[in-house]
């Protein structure tokens, strides 16, 4: 428990400020699995990496939160970072 959360945080902390902003915008429209809701826009845009990690885990739980984070990273062209995140969660 907690490994996926740490991997999400590590990935988000490695984004530049511009990339973190882009991540949030993509998160607002990323396709979600059935049964999951979207993090409200107002809350999302002001969050730092730590707050965003906690919000992702509380909304989507660790496993799906990590998968969703990896997918948004891929949508941003950060496939290598996405792969590292998923590798860290499957150790």
């Amino acid at each position: 428990m907690g490994r996926a959360r740490d991997a999400i945080l590590d990935a988000l902390e490695n984004l530049t400020a511009e990339e973190l902003a882009a991540f949030k915008l993509k998160l607002l429209s990323v396709p979600l699995r059935e049964g999951y809701g979207r993090i409200p826009r107002g809350a999302l845009l002001s969050m730092d990496a730590l707050d965003l990690t906690d919000k992702l885990v509380s909304f989507y739980l660790e496993t799906y939160g990590a998968e969703l984070t990896a997918n948004v990273l891929r949508d941003m062209g950060l496939q290598e970072m996405a792969g590292q995140l998923q590798a860290a969660t499957h150790q």
């Epitope: 993509k26 429209s29 990323v30 396709p31 997918n71 891929r74 949508d75 941003m76 062209g77 496939q79 290598e80 792969g83």
Partner: antibody
Framework: QVQLQQPGTELVKPGASVKLSCRAS?????????????LEWIGNINLSNGRTNYN??FRAMATLTVDKSSSTAYTQLSSLTSEDSAVYYC?????????????WGQGTSVTVSS | NIVMTQYPKSMSLSIGERVTLRCKAS??????VSWYQQKPEQSPKLLIY???NRYTGVPDRFTGSGSATDFILTITSVQAEDLADYHC?????????FGAGTKLELK
């Protein structure tokens, strides 16, 4: 429809280099296509922050750069051989999700010949 | 590297036929597959992204499906202007890779 501008043709000698340009934005990919063959991804560059990714197959011969002031992406191809005669496309990823290549330049035809 | 295998290599068909093109990834790529159409002496054009999302302006006779490793592009009633090469590509991992293509020809 966004148009990616690329010069049409380049004729270069074996062993020489060529620098291809593409007016673009966001993530710009470079893709090689030999006559009658499939598509090969060379690499990409993010025009806003200069972040690059390379296909290891092309890392030694391709160098991706960007000029932010003119929104132009470049690829320098060095030590060219006849195997490098191909059409080189630039393409953008502008769709928000799944990172497809949605806008393509018309391609630059590079002929390597003495 | 992820290998994308397309089959068949070519297909001869008549106008109005239903066509199924297949693409197989060597490992799980989720839904990160796109389909491109390329006519002779032209640049590729995006048809489908995210395995099943039709790109802007693409006729609804083109449908994408599949996930993980197996993907299909269906053309419900082929028109003359659809005779072209079709490439699948994955954007799940670097390096991005494409299939060798399927050529649609007139019978």
């Amino acid at each position: 429809q966004v148009q990616l501008q690329q010069p049409g043709t380049e004729l270069v000698k074996p062993g020489a280099s060529v620098k291809l340009s593409c007016r673009a934005s966001g993530w710009t990919h470079w893709v090689k296509q030999r006559p009658g063959q499939g598509l090969e991804w060379i690499g990409n560059i993010n025009l806003s922050n200069g972040r690059t990714n390379y296909n290891e197959k092309f890392r030694a011969m391709a160098t991706l750069t960007v000029d932010k002031s003119s929104s132009t992406a470049y690829t320098q191809l060095s030590s060219l051989t006849s195997e490098d005669s191909a059409v080189y496309y630039c393409a953008n990823s502008m769709v928000p999700h799944f990172f497809p290549m949605d806008y393509w330049g018309q391609g630059t035809s590079v002929t390597v010949s003495s | 590297n992820i290998v994308m295998t397309q089959y068949p290599k070519s297909m001869s068909l008549s106008i109005g036929e239903r066509v199924t093109l297949r693409c197989k990834a060597s490992e799980n790529v989720g839904s990160y597959v796109s389909w491109y159409q390329q006519k002779p002496e032209q640049s590729p054009k995006l048809l489908i992204y995210g395995a099943s999302n039709r790109y802007t302006g693409v006729p609804d006779r083109f449908t994408g499906s599949g996930s993980a490793t197996d993907f299909i592009l269906t053309i419900t009633s082929v028109q003359a202007e659809d005779l072209a090469d079709y490439h699948c590509g994955q954007s799940y991992n670097y390096p991005l890779t494409f299939g060798a293509g399927t050529k649609l020809e007139l019978k």
